[in-house]
């Protein structure tokens, strides 16, 4: 099946201090390689989460990514702050014969708006 990375929401709004879910699904796990989430684009993009076993404070996977047929790579960001505002991209990589892995497809991006905490 042809690989496609889908981020269904163009944007989400979340109150500061709350949690938000950023959805991402794949149509294929091939070619093998990791899936990572970034905020922003280009050289200055920031790694938010990687499905490769590392621990990321405040960010967790929504589905059980250890399922061998898992296609859901959605994440939950907890205790959101204004600094978390920006556009988030779910990115599929193909393993490389040497570092680094090759980016092969990205979702369309989900913009996160952080609202002031209601008083």
């Amino acid at each position: 099946k042809e690989l496609k990375v889908t981020q269904p929401e163009k944007s989400v709004s979340v109150a500061a201090g709350d949690s938000t879910v950023l959805n991402c699904t794949l149509t294929s796990l091939l070619p093998v390689g990791p899936i990572k989430w970034y905020r922003g684009v280009g050289q200055s993009r920031l790694l938010i989460y990687s499905f490769t076993g590392e621990h990321f404070p405040r960010v967790t996977n929504v589905s059980d990514a250890t399922k061998r047929n898992n296609m859901d790579f959605s994440i939950r960001i907890s205790n959101v702050t204004p600094e978390d505002a920006g556009t988030y991209y779910c990115v599929k990589f193909q393993k490389g014969p040497s570092e680094p892995d090759t980016e092969i497809q990205s979702g369309g991006g989900t913009e996160v708006y952080v609202l002031a905490k209601p008083s």
Epitope: L29, L30, P34, F51, K67, R68, N69, K95
Partner: antibody, heavy 118, light 107 residues
């Protein structure tokens, strides 16, 4: 330190059943998929079965499908392998192994010996 | 099935390369497992093609390209004598496989 300790091996007769256990410590057990691998005397390694971190999804090699059942109890940090209708060909050292994110193995137990003999 | 040589030998200090073929690069990740005696617990020396666990000496490295993976031991030592199994995970079939093992003798 990651530790995996298998138990439950022993000598059984052909046709009998056995349940192996693997006690895990030193890591968040509920976050990792796990597998069982065996090694027959004088032979190589053979992967048997794997299970997702939450326990909902299981995977088997064709030769043991329907006869072996992998399961886990995350509240006890334990992995299990139920083996039915055992034959002499099942004689082996059975290892539990922790899976990496891409379903290879990074830590192994010491193994437990299962001998099927009449 | 994964294929690897039955045996290799080297003098201390030499560089050893063990190859493993038979996987599809598009769908397979490789690992290398060291077993010092039959029935003893395997030790993972490389996983994810080229990742070395933190407690494994830096003389062990791995690579993969095409349909083959390679384990490289740079400056082999007597204590590296063991059987080395290559292992693979196939993302197309969801199955793990192993090679038959390579016996490394350090002369």
């Amino acid at each position: 330190d990651v530790q995996l300790v298998e138990s439950g091996g022993g000598v059984v007769r052909p046709g009998e059943s056995l349940r192996l256990s693997c006690a895990a410590s030193g890591f968040t057990f509920s976050s990792h998929a796990m597998s069982w691998v065996r090694q027959a005397p004088g032979k190589g390694l053979e992967w048997l079965a794997g299970i997702s971190a939450g326990g909902s999804d299981t995977y088997y090699i064709d030769s043991v499908k329907g006869r072996f059942t992998i399961s886990r109890d995350n509240s006890k940090s334990s992995l299990y392998l139920r083996m039915n209708s055992l034959t002499a060909e099942d004689t082996a050292v059975y290892y539990c192994a922790r899976e990496t994110w891409n379903h290879l193995f990074d830590y192994w137990g010491l193994g437990t010996l299962v001998t099927v003999s009449s | 099935a994964l294929t690897q040589p039955a045996s290799v030998s080297a003098n201390p200090g030499e560089t050893v390369k063990i190859t493993c073929s038979g996987g599809d690069y598009y769908s397979t990740y490789y690992a290398w497992y060291q077993q010092k005696s039959p029935g003893s617990a395997p030790v993972t020396v490389i996983h994810s093609d080229d990742e070395r666990p933190s407690d494994i000496p830096s003389r062990f490295s791995g690579s993969a390209s095409g349909s083959a993976a390679t384990l490289i031991i740079t400056g082999v030592r007597v204590e590296d004598e063991a059987v080395y199994f290559c292992g693979g995970y196939d993302g197309r079939t969801y199955i793990n496989t192993f090679g038959a093992g390579t016996t490394l003798t350090v002369l």
